[in-house]
Interface confidence: low
């Protein structure tokens, strides 16, 4: 399937002009490479009418060209001063021949239609409504006025000002006068449709005096915007619709053969196929609202339809919005795993990928909640503080540069299963979504921590060892101490694990931390974990509390930290850089202005990085050490 | 940053002119049609004049033609309107648009970005 993409089918009238926007994958060889403009003929032959090698034809002198925009993935043919002989096959399409890479365009130019010298035109969206005007002389003000619509052998009334209403109209049409002009009667059409488009007549009075008006009323529907992504990245629906359906239940569909199968809705509908990857957003008062796809999949390219009805549903009459949307399989993003799997009382690393282009940006983990429109309460951030709920069990570990990083979650318990989404507050289509299934255990963990219930005493030394199997010997492993801006890693030295050994004894296995001497800042969580260069793997929490010497421990240690309510948080995800697309000089606020934190971004994010140096001034030293023990029986 | 700079604006009699021009930057001004539209107190925003990118094609409302005449200059980067005959119902706010290109000259969904507007009021 080519990678190519642009409008499938492009219509205009005689004398009128176009522009064919065509996009391509994101690669310098795509940048630079020559695109072209080709009509296709009955032979197959794809005959070249304008490149960017700067190759003009014959029939395209003067009023054409064809400009390409590196910086945004796409080139844009414009022909102006169309005729009938334009209508045909076209490909737009990159490579030094035209049997490169390529899109088919069909390209339909009609006549312009014949209408009556004194005809006005009116040219409105689906949806909308038109306010007919038609003038009358002084002598016709008392007499009937009414508006028809032609047909082809009559002209069929709509409405007249003594009340009688073509059924097709009740409700829509109204035929009123404004103020005291009696020169100029109006008539108002709302819910406008296809079937409304065509030649009307107004009338005041009758017979040879009457006064007659011809109207031609266009009937559009909305143009699809087109929307090139890549897999697995996202996509934002913008959807402007007005302030007539602000208070209306809004909706977003994908056409399907003759119908529009609701996506996700304002009441609560959503296509389980879309479930944790999709949010709905409210925008204003003013009819706006968006709707983000992460998790992009081959089968989501189609053509999608925005409305409100209060319903929820898509309904004739009523305003929409259009786009047709290409999903890209020459992806930049990395292939990850969307499934993880843990066990309850263990823990999960998650890989989270971003544009490494963006490596200051700041990163965030969110988890998708289903209720309402759906949203994503950021639960940890590179500059965003842990949520109080997962104290002690979850952190982010940023690796700057290398377009990961990972976000590990320990001590899970059946409730954490869900969906999570990774984004950062650059390039919002490397937003990822992550699917945790947590099953119960059925066997010992990977790492244990002796002692479990750990209360050390002030100023005395205090040490607590990490077990793990034989198969991380080769890992490193590592403590850290937990706070809610992240898990410090404390220094480590490796004590025998590097020495060469025949057997590993599973029974032996152990990294150790020592606490000399024990202070009150002691207090807290504490991470034992493997990792694989700056690839995270599994681990384990614990609790130390630290008691005075001379009196029992008042401390009440947290022998669950799962047990904890959970808090129902109402804020959602903030993303100052979502909006996709301003449609506006005057810029439009981000679609998800009313959120929480992310807004007050520096340029520079301040970075939460793991970091090693964790010894402190008063001489207190903090180790841990791996051990590899020999026993003799 | 597309932005649209709209001038010209002020009272003038019926009858009388006034050429009201556009300051477009941050866009590929060449490619796109450009388009004015207006909005009168309590109406609706409705299209005046649109042209072509390269100048070849232009559309009039019926209510403007053979009294007003768009133009542009792609070196200068600017669009014109040059409004002759005013009448008193010609009075609103004159918004300069940039074009979709999405072959709709005179519908407002055709224009994605506006400038804020400069005021022509005719008196009688």
């Known amino acids: 399937k080519s990678p190519i993409f642009g409008p499938q089918e492009v219509s205009s009238i005689e004398g009128d002009s176009v522009s064919i926007t065509c996009y391509y994958p994101d690669t310098s060889v795509n940048r630079h490479t020559r695109k072209y403009w080709c009509r296709q003929g009955a032979s197959g032959m794809c005959t070249t009418l304008i490149s960017s090698n700067g190759y003009l034809s014959k029939e395209y002198s003067g009023r054409a060209n064809l400009i390409n925009f590196p910086e945004n993935n796409t080139f844009v043919i414009n022909i102006e001063q169309l005729t009938q002989d334009d209508t045909g096959s076209y490909k737009c399409g990159l490579g030094t021949s035209n049997r490169g890479l390529s899109f088919d365009v069909s390209l339909e130019v009609s006549q312009v239609p014949e209408l009556p010298s004194d005809t006005h035109v009116y040219t409105k969206d689906i949806g909308r409504n038109v306010t007919i005007e038609c003038p009358f002389k002084r002598e016709n003000a008392p007499s009937k006025k009414s508006l028809c619509k032609k047909t082809n052998q009559s002209c069929e009334l709509v409405i007249d000002s003594t009340e009688k209403v073509n059924p097709s109209y009740i409700g829509r049409a109204k035929l009123f006068m404004k103020g005291t002009d009696l020169t100029v009667f109006y008539v108002n059409i709302s819910h406008l449709t296809h079937n409304d488009a065509g030649l009307y007549i107004c009338q005041a009075g009758e017979g040879p005096s009457a006064d007659k008006k011809n109207v031609d009323l266009q009937v559009l529907a909305p143009e699809p915007e087109l929307l090139y992504k890549d897999l697995r990245s996202s996509v934002t629906f913008e959807c402007d619709l007005g302030r007539e359906v602000a208070n209306e239940a809004k909706y977003l569909c994908r056409m399907n053969k003759e119908t529009c199968d609701v996506i996700i809705n304002t009441l609560g509908k959503r296509d389980p196929d879309f479930e944790g990857r999709i949010l709905i957003t409210p925008k204003d008062d003013n009819g706006r609202f968006s709707v983000l796809i992460t998790g992009l999949r081959k089968e989501d390219a189609g053509h999608y339809q925005c409305g409100a009805h209060s319903s929820g549903l898509p309904q004739e009459g009523w305003p929409i919005q259009t786009w047709q949307l290409f999903v890209n399989e020459e992806s930049t993003i990395p292939n990850r795993r969307s499934v993880v799997k843990g066990v309850t009382g263990g823990s999960v690393a998650i890989a989270c990928p971003y544009n490494p282009k963006e490596s200051s940006s700041l990163k965030y983990w969110c988890r998708w909640e289903g209720d309402g429109n759906g949203h994503c309460p950021v639960l940890v951030g590179t500059q965003a503080q842990v949520q109080e709920e997962y104290e002690g069990r979850l952190a982010l570990f940023d690796q700057p540069g290398n377009g990961t990083y990972t976000v590990i979650l320990n001590q899970l318990t059946t409730e954490d299963a869900g969906f999570y989404w990774c984004l950062t507050n650059g390039d919002s289509r490397w937003r990822t979504t992550i699917e945790l299934q947590v099953a119960e255990a059925t066997r010992e963990p990977n790492l244990e921590v002796t002692p479990q219930n750990a209360t050390a005493v002030l100023g005395e030394t205090f040490t607590v060892s990490c077990h793990y199997p034989c198969k991380f010997y080769s890992q490193e492993k590592y403590w850290c101490k937990w706070s809610n801006k992240g898990c410090h890693i404390l220094p480590s030295h490796d004590e025998g694990a590097r020495q060469s050994s025949v057997s590993c004894d599973q029974s032996s296995q152990l990294v150790s931390m020592t606490l000399n001497p024990v202070s009150k800042e002691d207090e807290g969580w504490y991470w034992c974990g493997v990792k694989q260069g700056q690839t995270y793997g599994e681990t384990t929490a614990i609790y130390i509390a630290v008691e005075e010497r001379t009196r029992g421990s008042s401390h009440v240690n947290p022998t669950d930290a799962n047990a904890r309510a959970k808090v129902a948080l109402e804020e959602e995800v903030v993303d100052s850089s979502i909006s996709e697309k301003e449609n506006k000089a005057i810029p439009n606020p981000g679609p998800f202005a009313n959120e929480r934190e992310i807004q007050n971004v520096g340029d520079q994010a301040q970075e939460n990085r793991a970091s090693g140096d964790a010894g402190s001034a008063d001489g207190q030293s903090r180790s841990s050490s791996s051990k590899h023990h020999h026993h003799h029986h | 940053q597309v932005q649209l700079v709209e001038s010209g604006g002020g009272l003038v009699q019926t009858g009388g002119s006034l050429r009201l021009s556009c300051a477009a930057s941050g866009l590929t001004f060449s490619s796109y049609t450009m388009g004015w539209f207006r909005q009168a107190p309590g109406k609706e925003r409705e299209f005046v004049a649109a042209i072509s990118w390269g100048g070849a094609s232009t559309w009039y409302a019926d209510s403007v033609k053979g009294r007003f005449t768009i133009s542009r200059d792609n070196a200068k980067t600017m669009v014109y309107l040059q409004m002759n005959g005013l009448k008193p119902e010609d009075t609103a706010v004159y918004y300069c648009?940039?074009?979709?290109?999405?072959?709709?000259?005179?519908?407002?969904?055709?224009?994605?970005?506006w400038g804020q507007g400069t005021l022509v009021t005719v008196s009688s």
């Open positions: 648009a940039k074009g979709r290109n999405n072959g709709y000259a005179t519908a407002v969904r055709a224009y994605d970005y």
